[in-house]
Interface confidence: low
């Protein structure tokens, strides 16, 4: 019968002939009376056999990622008679893996959005690298993820590639971060190959800033002839947040005379001071009122940022009009 062991050839061998093993018949007594032949895909081009001994050699560099096994056929013939000594037999040559492929991130570019001020541990995004090497061959395709850039704000789980927040971030200071993740095979051991990817992490706004008046004192004037409903001027607050988090409502905090009102222009986010009751220069020629400003939408959990509303003082001078 046929005698052989399992055949393996390492991929990417640089030698011009690599001995893989020997195929032989147990009837072969070593007197060179038998001839061995190799048939099938790769016979004669990738693999050759020593016709006398049955020794098999690989004569080309192989790439496991291109082809991981070869199925060949062997024959042994008695030279004197030309007859087959053994029935033709099929055998397999397996290409064994070496760590010649670096991990690759196939889904890049990565981009994620996470709310500012998110607590430590908040999941941002998961990045995944793939390695073309053999996952069943040692650690060639076992990956470990690490953070090359992004400390101290982000961390990555070494085995999953899950990126989490490790320090609170304030959008008003910096609104986006580039994080660079490295995937290393061989679980980081010597000879490891690595791949990197960049993740753009954008911070979405939360309402962590209250509106604050630009001025602590506004001076306005109103003619005593002005009818009720007249707009007599505008006041303005600024809010470092954006979008609906910067929408605000102005109101009167103090007006003993109950002469004025403030309405909010939601287009411009300005407060418009309105005359609620007609004024009379001869009766009172100036007024002092206090206005306050608050955000329109403040979720319960963000109320701590909005404890005391910003206020401003408005001095209103009444202009005299000649009366008949």
């Amino acid at each position: 019968g046929w005698v052989w062991n399992q055949f393996f050839v390492p991929e990417e061998m640089n030698t011009t002939s690599h001995h893989i093993g020997q195929l032989r018949s147990d009837l072969d007594n070593g007197n060179n009376s038998f001839q061995y032949k190799l048939l099938g895909a790769g016979a004669g081009s990738t693999f050759i056999i020593d016709e006398r001994t049955g020794d098999i050699y690989a004569i080309q560099k192989l790439d496991r990622e291109e082809r991981s096994l070869y199925i060949l056929r062997a024959q042994v013939i008695d030279i004197a008679t030309g007859r087959a000594v053994e029935p033709e037999s099929e055998f397999v040559i397996k290409v064994s893996d070496i760590n010649d492929n670096e991990p690759k991130f196939l889904d890049e570019p990565y981009e994620a959005i996470v709310p500012e001020m998110s607590p430590e541990g908040t999941l941002v995004i998961q990045v995944t690298a793939s390695d073309a090497d053999d996952p069943s061959s040692g650690n060639n395709a076992r990956l470990l993820y690490s953070l090359l850039q992004g400390q101290p704000y982000f961390s990555v789980e070494p085995t999953t590639g899950v990126i989490r927040i490790s320090s609170k971030m304030d959008r008003e200071l910096q609104d986006e971060y580039w994080v660079i993740i490295q995937a290393k095979d061989m679980i980081g051991q010597p000879g490891a190959l690595s791949g990197t990817t960049s993740v753009l992490i954008k911070l979405s706004d939360v309402n962590d800033n209250k509106p604050i008046f630009k001025e602590s004192l506004y001076r306005l004037t109103v003619s005593e002839s002005a009818p009720t409903g007249t707009s007599i001027g505008t006041i303005m607050a600024y809010d470092n947040d954006i979008g609906e988090n910067a929408e605000m409502d102005y109101s009167i905090e103090e007006d003993d005379s109950q002469t004025f009102d403030i309405i909010t222009n939601h287009e411009t986010q300005e407060g418009i001071v309105i005359l609620k009751k007609k004024v009379d220069f001869e009766h009172q020629n100036h007024y002092g009122i206090r206005a306050k400003v608050k955000n329109h939408h403040v979720p319960e959990q963000l109320m701590k940022y909005h404890t005391e509303a910003s206020t401003t003082f408005i001095k209103i001078q009444v202009e005299d009009v000649d009366e008949p």
Epitope: Q149, I180, T196, S198
Partner: antibody, heavy 120, light 110 residues
Framework: QVQLVQSGAEVKKPGASVKVSCKAS????????MSWVRQAPGQGLEWMGI????????TYAQKFQGRVTMTRDTSTSTVYMELSSLRSEDTAVYYC?????????????WGQGTLVTVSS | QSVLTQPPSASGTPGQRVTISCSGS????????VNWYQQLPGTAPKLLIY???QRPSGVPDRFSGSKSGTSASLAISGLQSEDEADYYC???????????FGGGTKLTVL
């Protein structure tokens, strides 16, 4: 907008030291690395080292180790590069360049350059 | 002698496509992002391509970058006279623990 403004040209004698400054504005100074790159007349670009303005950590190119010192002043958003034991081959334009948040990123903004001439 | 090898010069006529190569090793181009800089005569360098193939805003899409193994290249299509400049590749080198630049390529628009 981001701006890096460097100090003016210098003429130094061999053996002396030179200190070049680079004032940053338009961004959070402590969040970005700053590198120094030089270019000798008619030559290519050569990286000298990098400093992180937040902690002051530095990494210097092997070639300049022992001769270059990079420092920063966070109160004025300024980084400094001092090169000692000057020789004629140190005649070059010295650029500060903002390196991305960490070393693996690009230099996205550059100073206008400072010409240092070393001549006896 | 630069760690990254670039051709010293390249040329083309307006409208043509030119490619500038940058060859390195496993410790630099093989394992890190490649960046390209353009330096117009008498000015500071300007970022042209970052992280292998990304263009900063304001850089025309005529400029493109690519990387394969330990080599990178910069392609400029529809060449214009204002592209006449020096071009440098740059990458972080893990062995040297520092940035390395190519020797630069002087592009002439004929």
């Amino acid at each position: 907008q981001v701006q890096l403004v460097q100090s003016g040209a210098e003429v130094k004698k061999p053996g002396a030291s030179v200190k070049v400054s680079c004032k940053a504005s338009g961004y959070t100074f402590t969040s970005y690395y700053m590198s120094w790159v030089r270019q000798a007349p008619g030559q290519g670009l050569e990286w000298m080292g990098i400093i992180h303005p937040s902690g002051g950590d530095t990494t210097y190119a092997q070639k300049f180790q022992g001769r270059v010192t990079m420092t920063r002043d966070t109160s004025t958003s300024t980084v400094y590069m001092e090169l000692s034991s000057l020789r004629s081959e140190d005649t070059a334009v010295y650029y500060c360049a903002r390196g991305g948040i960490k070393l693996w990123l690009h230099f996205d903004y550059w100073g206008q350059g400072t010409l240092v001439t070393v001549s006896s | 002698q630069s760690v990254l090898t670039q051709p010293p010069s390249a040329s083309g006529t307006p409208g043509q496509r030119v490619t500038i190569s940058c060859s390195g090793s496993r410790s630099n181009i093989g394992s890190n992002f490649v960046n390209w800089y353009q330096q117009l005569p008498g000015t500071a360098p300007k970022l042209l391509i970052y992280t292998n193939n990304q263009r900063p805003s304001g850089v025309p899409d005529r400029f493109s970058g690519s990387k394969s193994g330990t080599s990178a290249s910069l392609a400029i299509s529809g060449l214009q006279s204002e592209d006449e400049a020096d071009y440098y590749c740059a990458v972080w080198d893990d062995s040297l623990n520092g940035w390395v630049f190519g020797g630069g390529t002087k592009l002439t628009v004929l």
